[in-house]
């Protein structure tokens, strides 16, 4: 059961997993999306293009994810489990100007040892 | 501090091959995006090349291109410039510089730190 | 390519003084991908601003930057002995281009 607002789709959860989505500007063609549980990140993700339109992504911390042209969704297959946690991604623009970085609205995530059920309270 | 230093400048004769090299220090290499600038002693800058963060994406100035190759190894902390069949237009000082934004990206962004250049002559 | 064009080449102004230096792209500089770096003899290029009005890290709030579309301007508000250098305007968008530079000396 997730609670909070209807429409916010930031987190959604199947296979024992959570997605993560972190939505961001569709005119935004150079930026970093970090994902954090509360002060640690879990996931860094930064896209970058060159010349003729070539994408390349950097993916450190070698999370699952997917990236569509206004979203970055991170999966967390063991996500903590033993107390709530707050979720917030962060936004870095490079492209196009002016630079931007800017935390994005985060979510209070509570996984029941069962993960059958979870409760979600959102903090925007 | 951050420092770019380049090295392998000289005299060489039109025709010739000479390979750049900047060897970079006090910041995460792979964090950035990099150029080659070059610069006619008491004349303007010239963009030259660029590189993002692994290689994936490069480009060349319409002047260069099909001459010049761009490289880096992340594990030396260093980017190159093969320069081949060396003109005496190509006669310059060849600065490296870093992206502005740690984005990993050489395209669309401003270049912060530069190196203090390395001397190219082409002359017979 | 878009082609810079700084004016004016050289500006002979004393310390104190207000610089205004002007730069015109040939055809519009999309989403304001414009920069402004400053030299000194002997020295590497300094970013000044980017993003047409942006300024860099650790630069002084003397410097500002504005303009869009085709038309920027680098304004010093009150120049400092340090500032007499050579500025270049840069479009960053896609192929990187400098203007030719203006020399700012003192009178």
């Known amino acids: 059961e997730i609670n909070g607002s209807a429409d916010h789709r930031m987190f959604s959860f199947h296979n024992g997993g959570v997605q993560i989505s972190c939505k961001y500007p569709e005119t935004v063609q150079q930026l970093k999306m970090r994902l954090f549980r509360e002060r640690e990140v879990l996931c860094e993700l930064t896209k970058t293009k060159g010349s003729g339109n070539a994408v390349s992504i950097k993916n450190p911390m070698l999370c699952l994810y997917h990236l569509s042209n206004n979203s970055v969704s991170f999966f967390l297959n063991n996500p903590d489990s033993s107390q709530g946690s707050y979720y917030f991604c962060s936004l870095s623009i490079f492209d196009p100007p002016p630079f931007q970085e800017r935390n994005l609205s985060g979510g209070y995530l509570h996984i029941y040892e069962s993960q059958l059920c979870c409760q979600l309270k959102l903090w925007l | 501090e951050v420092q770019l230093v380049e090295s392998g400048g000289g005299v060489v004769r039109p025709g010739g091959s000479l390979r750049l090299s900047c060897a970079a220090s006090g910041l995460t290499f792979d964090d950035y995006g990099m150029s080659w600038v070059r610069q006619v002693p008491g004349k303007g800058l010239e963009w030259v090349s660029g590189i993002n963060w692994n290689g994936d994406n490069t480009d060349y100035a319409d002047s260069v291109k099909g001459r010049f190759t761009i490289s880096r190894d992340n594990a030396k902390n260093s980017l190159y410039l093969q320069m081949n069949s060396l003109r005496a237009e190509d006669t310059a000082l060849y600065y490296c510089a870093r992206d502005y934004y740690g984005s990993g990206s050489y395209y669309n962004v401003p270049f912060d730190y530069w190196g203090q250049g390395t001397l190219v002559t082409v002359s017979s | 390519e878009i082609v810079l064009t700084q004016s004016p080449g050289t500006l002979s102004l004393s310390p104190g003084e207000r610089a205004t230096l002007s730069c015109r792209a040939s055809q519009s500089v999309s989403s304001s991908y414009l920069a402004w770096y400053q030299q000194k003899p002997g020295q590497a290029p300094r970013l000044l601003i980017y993003?047409?009005?942006s300024r860099a890290t650790g630069i002084p709030d003397r410097f500002s930057g504005s303009g869009s579309g085709t038309d920027f301007t680098l304004t010093i508000r009150r120049l400092e002995p340090e500032d007499f250098a050579v500025y270049y305007c840069?479009?960053?968008?896609?192929?990187?281009?400098f203007g030719p530079g203006t020399k700012v000396d003192i009178k």
């Open positions: 840069q479009q960053y968008g896609s192929s990187p281009f």
């Open positions: 993003g047409a009005s």
